[in-house]
Interface confidence: medium
């Protein structure tokens, strides 16, 4: 395995309930460069298995946005712009990261969460379950 | 904007950086409860607009590990199973939080971070420019 | 590959505490949990907890609580499960297990127990 | 805390026969369920993950079924080397658990 030296000049933690709590600067380092995500704006349109998005909103939060992708069709867009339903249209979904306001409304208190979310859809070939 | 009132019994931060450095309970509330289990898939798989998952590893940040959709082709696969280049496989981007150790290798301090994932890949209508 | 070795048997009197180790080797320690699992002779596997080696905390099981002190050190990137109180009930087989500990992404595992340790005994006895 | 029922306890199985080990859940799950298979004197090692996915290096004779609260682990055309006991463990929520086991002889 990879051995990590303790960085000497590391902040101290007194606190009772650490490492529990810890302090999170955020000032929020933005990693994309160079990426344009504007380019997939209008994916969930142009997609076989188009969407729509939910707005999401929830001020104890961080993000307090989230976007959440509902698939307009059980099946898919085929070539005369028609639904076929021997296709799927289904959910791809990600868990991710936010903080969460505890205790409630304070300014400077959070608490990691995990919560599952949906990105766009994709269309897929069905399952068949054959009956014996 | 929505105003939150302040609650009374939230701790009180004295530290120069506030409000940029909060506190943040690290033990990780999972809000993926059984109105929306994960349901483990392979998609990535049957898509129409096929997916590889590659592993991106940093032990500075968290998540460690993110896993990273790659389109398999340019075009879609069709119903005879081959790759149709009148239309086009493309990402679906997600901007997500993740924290950063800061200073490195210290084990109670971090930044939020957002980085752009690729979640995975669906089939749109190719964009066609028409040259006068 | 990814390689969990823990230390050798123990015999514990009553009352008395073990600390059990268990080195990983492979991969980045930082990027997975380590959980430890008990097995009485004849009987189960028994979650008792496990440690995010990220942030270094543990949760435990509820009958566990109070007894047992899981702790990571990435410097050796070592997990350890301390087991203080100890009565003949506590005679098992003690293994730590690699927590992937992955975002879900729709289809890699998150928490399934892929690597486990060789084992430890832990006889109590008067 | 969820509880993980399994059946039967115990099954003395030909070679070559298929065999069917079922798990059930206290609760929803969803498709956080994983299976084990461990030999005497051995650690356990990882068979069927996230219900239905297979893990390398695995024989493909071991599948897993199921989401929510019921579970299923198929073994196509026993092998003797597969003579052991089978847990499954649900990783949904904590505390995690693991089912009592199954344990498979061969005739």
């Known amino acids: 395995g990879i051995t990590i030296p303790r960085n000497p000049g590391c902040p101290n933690s007194e606190d009772k309930n650490f490492p529990r709590t810890v302090m999170v600067n955020l000032n929020i380092h933005n990693r994309n460069t160079n990426t344009n995500p504007k380019r997939s704006s209008d994916y969930y349109n142009r997609s076989t298995s188009p969407w729509n998005l939910h707005r999401n909103e929830d001020p104890e939060r961080y993000p307090s946005v989230i976007w959440e992708a509902k698939c307009r069709h059980l099946g898919c867009i085929n070539a005369d712009g028609n639904v076929d339903y021997h296709m799927n249209s289904v959910p791809i979904q990600q868990e991710i990261l936010v903080l969460r306001r505890e205790p409630p409304h304070c300014p400077n208190s959070f608490r990691l969460e995990k919560i599952l979310v949906s990105v766009g859809c994709t269309c897929v070939t069905p399952i068949v379950h054959h009956v014996a | 904007g929505i105003t939150i009132p302040r609650n009374p019994g939230c701790p009180n931060s004295e530290d120069k950086n506030f409000p940029r450095t909060v506190m943040v309970n690290l033990n990780i509330h999972n809000r993926n409860t059984n109105t929306n289990p994960k349901r483990s898939s392979d998609y990535y798989n049957r898509s129409t607009s096929p997916w590889n998952l590659h592993r991106n590893e940093d032990p500075e940040r968290y998540p460690s590990v993110i896993w990273e959709a790659k389109c398999r082709h340019l075009g879609c696969i069709n119903a005879d199973g081959n790759v149709d280049y009148h239309m086009n496989s493309v990402p679906i981007q997600q901007e997500i939080l993740v924290l950063r150790r800061e200073p490195p290798h210290c084990p109670n301090s971090f930044r939020l971070e957002k980085i752009l994932v690729s979640v995975g890949c669906t089939c749109v209508t190719p964009i066609v420019h028409h040259v006068a | 590959e990814v390689q969990l070795v823990q230390s050798g048997a123990e015999v514990k009197k009553p009352g008395s505490s073990v600390k059990v180790s268990c080195k990983a080797s492979?991969?980045?320690?930082?990027?997975?949990?380590i959980c430890w699992v008990r097995q009485a002779p004849g009987q189960g596997l028994e979650w008792m907890g496990g440690?995010?080696?990220?942030?270094?905390?543990?949760d435990y099981a509820q009958k566990f609580q109070g007894r047992v002190t899981i702790t990571a050190d990435e410097s050796t990137t070592t997990a350890y499960m301390e087991l203080s109180g100890l009565t003949s009930d506590d005679t098992a087989v003690y293994y730590c297990a690699r927590d992937p500990n992955e975002f879900w992404n729709g289809y890699y595992a998150t928490h399934d127990f892929d690597y486990w340790g060789q084992g430890t005994t832990v006889t109590v006895s008067s | 805390e969820i509880v993980l029922t399994q059946s039967p306890d115990f099954q003395s199985v030909t070679p070559k026969e298929k065999v069917t080990i079922t798990c059930r859940a206290s609760?929803?799950?969803?498709?956080?369920l994983h299976w084990y298979q461990q030999k005497p004197d051995q650690s356990p090692k990882l068979l069927i993950k996230?219900?239905?996915h297979s893990v390398s290096g695995v024989p493909s004779r071991f599948s897993g079924s199921g989401s929510g609260t019921d579970f299923t682990l198929t073994i196509n055309g026993l092998e003797a080397e597969d003579a052991g006991t089978y847990y499954c463990?649900?990783?949904?929520?904590?505390?995690?658990?693991f089912g009592p086991g199954t344990k498979v002889d061969i005739k």
């Open positions: 996230y219900a239905s």
């Open positions: 463990h649900q990783s949904y929520m904590l505390p995690y658990s």
């Open positions: 609760q929803n799950i969803g498709s956080e």
């Open positions: 492979g991969g980045s320690f930082s990027s997975y949990g």
């Open positions: 440690v995010t080696t990220f942030f270094g905390f543990a």
